[in-house]
Structure formats: structure tokens, C-alpha cells
């Protein structure tokens, strides 16, 4: 069974998938469509890297642009370095500016909903 066939079988169960499962899926050429991606748990999507999301979506990655202001895409963009987002060539905006450090302060992030940044 190839990646696409596998994805069709599990598609309806993906809404509650944890980050680990999404990372694993990204290695299987599933080409997840944006409608499915938008239904994923925000907390499961946030830890994914730009490279992992690109692999997870395959050719559908260009659809991120149309949904860049909808969750979970919006929240995911806010967690990525702008340099990394730029590699997609989609014109995505709102990433962490170059030269900033991301501090993983769980309490700070839980309160504010955004990562804590330290300027250069």
C-alpha cells in the first residue's frame, strides 16, 4: 500500500492525531490535503518544522498561503523562523524575525499564546 492509499484509510481518524504521528506521516509521502490539515489539533501541529509540514502536505503545501490567517496554520507560522518559511516560496508572513531567539518558556507561552522572543 502506497502513502496515498494509506492516507485515505486513516484520514477520518487524523483529527486527534498527536505530533509524533504527524511526524511519522510526514515520512510516508501521504500528501495530506489542506482540508484535513486544518482539522488537526493545533497543539499537535505547532511542534512540526517547516520541512516536516512540507513533506506532510507534499504538493498541497502551496495551500498554506490561502489559509495563513486561519488556525492552525496561523499559529504554526508564528512559531517558525521567517527564514525557514521563506524557503517555501509562498510569501508566508508572520514568522520569527531573523536573529531572534525563541525561549521555550511553557508558562509564558500558556499565558500569552505566543512564544517568548529575545531580540538580537
Amino acid at each position: 500500500m502506497n502513502g496515498s492509499e494509506y492516507f485515505v484509510k486513516i484520514q477520518s481518524f487524523l483529527g486527534g492525531a498527536p505530533t509524533e504521528d504527524l511526524k511519522a506521516l510526514s515520512q510516508q509521502n501521504v500528501s495530506m490535503d489542506l482540508a484535513t490539515f486544518m482539522k488537526l489539533r493545533t497543539d499537535a501541529v505547532l511542534p512540526l518544522t517547516v520541512a516536516e509540514v512540507q513533506k506532510l502536505l507534499g504538493p498541497h503545501v502551496e495551500g498554506l498561503k490561502a489559509e495563513e490567517r486561519h488556525r492552525p496554520v496561523r499559529d504554526w507560522i508564528l512559531r517558525q523562523r521567517q527564514d525557514d518559511l521563506d524557503t517555501l516560496g509562498l510569501g508566508l508572513q508572520g514568522g520569527i524575525p531573523n536573529g531572534y531567539l525563541v525561549l521555550d518558556l511553557s508558562m509564558q507561552e500558556a499565558l500569552s499564546g505566543t512564544p517568548c522572543l529575545l531580540g538580537p
Epitope: 482540508a35 482539522k39 495551500g63 490561502a66
Partner: antibody, heavy 119, light 108 residues
Framework: EVQLVQSGAEVKKPGASVKVSCKAS????????MDWVRQAPGQGLEWMGD????????IYNQKFSGRVTMTEDKSASTVYMELSSLRSEDTAVYYC????????????WGQGTTVTVSS | EIVLTQSPATLSLSPGERATLSCSAS???????LSWYQQKPGQSPRLLIY???NLASGIPARFSGSGSGTDYTLTISSLEPEDFAVYYC?????????FGGGTKVEIK
């Protein structure tokens, strides 16, 4: 057949609110966002915002922020657009338009709802 | 916001002639994020072209689109009677999404 059927024409007084419905049929409702676009008499098209029927997430054009609210009823495959604090310049035809999630173009449009704001 | 300026505002042509409609953006637009719509009097808009040059379903091949950056063009190779209408360009490269003011193609 894919169809978007909108509610009928409305006449409202300045300061009032209007709620327009858009019932979708012929496709998987949650695979498409629904956008709202308006057209004042003899004028061009103006994008108002959109709603993702799957999540209920909304994005509004800042021009309408605070006055527009978009909602959905998945069980009825229907989206709603409510515009408050109406003024005469809100007189327009309001269209719902289907947009496949992950794209930015509108491939199916409703027939339009005429909203007239007059004292 | 990106302002889309369409020219000319009105194009007077005869059936069989070639129509060239322009759409100029105030800032660069990624070509995948530009589309064209046709609207006839009393009707809803209809998608003609998406991603600058892709024909929407059911649209005849006499319609074509091209362009990049800030300049985009819709061409109708040979006007048919049903092509006389208003045409709008639309961008979703930058928020908020915007439409051009329209070009009316009328019978000369």
C-alpha cells in the same frame, strides 16, 4: 449539482442589522471555505471575509471588523453573514462564494442577496 | 492593501476582434495568487482563470491569462457575443484580498 442558495432581499433602516444566509448543496460542505463578497450599485467587488465551516474559524477584512460576523450550521450546510450598524453605503448585493480550502479563488457563487439601507 | 488597477475602464470592440485587458498591482503579486472573473448584468461573477493562466472548468480556450509581478493580462482571442461583460482581476497574495475596479467589454 453544486449550488449556493442565498436568502431573499432585505430592506433595513440605518443602525439596524441584517443576517444573510447561504445554503450549500451538492458537495462536501467542510472541504470548502465560504467567503462573502459585496457589490455596491454600479461598483466593483469587495471581499468581506470568510469562514471555515469545519472549524468555525473566521477571517474578516479589517474594514468590516467589529460589524461583521460569519457563522455556520454544519447540520444544515448553511453559513450566515451578519452585518450590524448598517449605513446607507452598505446598500449592495451580498454574495457568498465557495473557496476550496487551500486555494484563494471562488469557483461557485450564490445568486446574491440585495440589501437596501434606507431611512 | 494591494490596489488592483484595471485598464481600460471600457473596451469597445466588435465580435471576432481580440480583447486585451490589463490589471496592474500596486505591489508585486505572486502569480499563483491572481485570478479573473466575468460578470454579466444581473448575474453573479463567474470564475474564468485562476493562478494567472489556468482556465476554470467549462471556460472556452479563447480566454487566456498571463503576467507576473505587478502586471497581468487577460486576453480574449476572438470575441463572441456572449463575451460582452465586465471582467475583474482578483489577488489573494496579500491581505486583505482585493479586486480590480473592472473592465467593461462592450459592443462597438
Amino acid at each position: 449539482e453544486v449550488q449556493l442558495v442565498q436568502s431573499g432581499a432585505e430592506v433595513k433602516k440605518p443602525g439596524a442589522s441584517v443576517k444573510v444566509s447561504c445554503k450549500a448543496s451538492g458537495y462536501t460542505f467542510t472541504d470548502y471555505n465560504m467567503d462573502w463578497v459585496r457589490q455596491a450599485p454600479g461598483q466593483g467587488l469587495e471581499w468581506m471575509g470568510d469562514i471555515n465551516p469545519s472549524t468555525g474559524g473566521t477571517i474578516y477584512n479589517q474594514k468590516f471588523s467589529g460589524r461583521v460576523t460569519m457563522t455556520e450550521d454544519k447540520s444544515a450546510s448553511t453559513v450566515y453573514m451578519e452585518l450590524s450598524s448598517l449605513r446607507s453605503e452598505d446598500t449592495a448585493v451580498y454574495y457568498c462564494a465557495r473557496r476550496r480550502i487551500g486555494t484563494g479563488y471562488f469557483d461557485v457563487w450564490g445568486q446574491g442577496t440585495t440589501v437596501t439601507v434606507s431611512s | 492593501e494591494i490596489v488592483l488597477t484595471q485598464s481600460p475602464a471600457t473596451l469597445s470592440l466588435s465580435p471576432g476582434e481580440r480583447a486585451t485587458l490589463s490589471c496592474s498591482a500596486s505591489s508585486s503579486v505572486i502569480s499563483s495568487y491572481l485570478s479573473w472573473y466575468q460578470q454579466k448584468p444581473g448575474q453573479s461573477p463567474r470564475l474564468l482563470i485562476y493562478r494567472t493562466s489556468n482556465l476554470a472548468s467549462g471556460i472556452p480556450a479563447r480566454f487566456s491569462g498571463s503576467g507576473s509581478g505587478t502586471d497581468y493580462t487577460l486576453t480574449i482571442s476572438s470575441l463572441e457575443p456572449e463575451d460582452f461583460a465586465v471582467y475583474y482581476c482578483h489577488q489573494w497574495s496579500s491581505f486583505p484580498y482585493t479586486f480590480g475596479g473592472g473592465t467593461k467589454v462592450e459592443i462597438k
